[in-house]
């Protein structure tokens, strides 16, 4: 079934499904998925020239 | 360890079937999508289809719709690829991979971050 | 459908050089794009997702950048290993579409 556009920002979705506490919707599928916790920057040390590349945890299975 | 194993593939004249299978380990497909993606010889990526195996819920692309089924045993942890009615055009390595989602606001922040080793399928007379 | 156009198709670098690729897509896709490095007969590997989150065990030389529709993977120091094939694909609406991709091969 196709099904159109949506944003990150559900500008256009109608607003997600609540979700499971480890669960969060996936707007490319329209359903509570699996989901990971996103890693902020650590901060460099002083000095250093350019910010840590974000990471990210593994996902919970 | 999270793993993908595709199956199934193989040589088919056109106009003929084969069934792709997708065997999973280390993770519980029913919490993800899975999808498949296929590459031609020398070509870039295709997205094929994709499932939510805890609902069934699907997708496929305009090149393959009403030709090509996505389905899912979550009690074996396998997804599968129905082809039918193939074309020369099909000739592809075919893998399958996991979305996997990321929590940004409560939603999902997502790619596919597990592929399997690809089959090859070989549509010729 | 979005269209995702990736230039340039190839390049020739040196290591160390610092490569930089970008991708356009044909409409607003806000953060949902992720780059895939792949080598020849081997399945494509996440590098970075939602636009800039550098996947688990990727090298912190590679980096993304961008929204809406431009978008950039950069190398900042590439090494023998990296010569590949990156593509970028969208995830904002389905079909999730690829770039043609972009290979990088040595000088």
């Known amino acids: 079934m196709r099904r159109g556009p949506r944003s990150l920002r559900g500008r256009d979705a109608p607003a997600p499904t609540p979700c499971v506490p480890a669960e969060c919707f996936d707007l490319l599928v329209r359903h509570c998925v699996a989901c990971g916790l996103l890693r902020t920057p650590r901060p460099k040390p002083a000095g250093a020239s350019s910010p840590a590349p974000r990471t990210a945890l593994q996902p919970q299975e | 360890e999270v793993q993908l194993v595709e199956s199934g593939g193989g040589l088919v004249q056109p106009g003929g079937s084969l069934r792709l299978s997708c065997a999973a380990s280390g993770f519980t497909i029913s919490s993800n999508s899975i999808h498949w993606v296929r590459q031609a010889p020398g070509k870039g990526l295709e997205w094929v289809a994709w499932i939510t195996p805890s609902d069934g819920n699907t997708d496929y692309a305009d090149s393959v719709k009403g030709r090509f089924t996505i389905s899912a045993d979550t009690s074996k942890n396998t997804a599968y690829l129905q082809m039918n009615s193939l074309r020369a055009e099909d000739t592809a390595v075919y893998y399958c991979?996991?979305?996997?989602?990321?929590?940004?606001?409560?939603?999902?922040?997502?790619?596919?971050?597990?592929w399997g080793q690809g089959t090859l399928v070989t549509v010729s007379s | 459908d979005i269209q995702m156009t990736q230039s340039p198709s190839s390049l020739s670098a040196s290591v160390g050089d610092r490569v930089t690729i970008t991708c356009r897509a044909s409409q607003d896709v806000s953060t949902a794009v992720a780059w895939y490095q792949q080598k020849p007969g081997k399945a494509p590997k996440l590098l970075i997702y939602s636009a800039s989150f550098l996947y688990s065990g990727v090298p912190s030389r590679f980096s993304g950048s961008g929204s809406g529709t431009d978008f950039t993977l950069t190398i900042s120091s590439l090494q023998p290993e990296d010569f590949a094939t990156y593509y970028c694909?969208?995830?904002?609406?389905?079909?999730?579409?690829f770039g043609q991709g972009t290979k990088v091969e040595i000088k």
């Open positions: 694909q969208q995830s904002y609406s389905t079909p999730p579409t």
């Open positions: 991979a996991r979305r996997v989602c990321y929590d940004r606001a409560r939603v999902c922040a997502g790619a596919m971050d597990y």
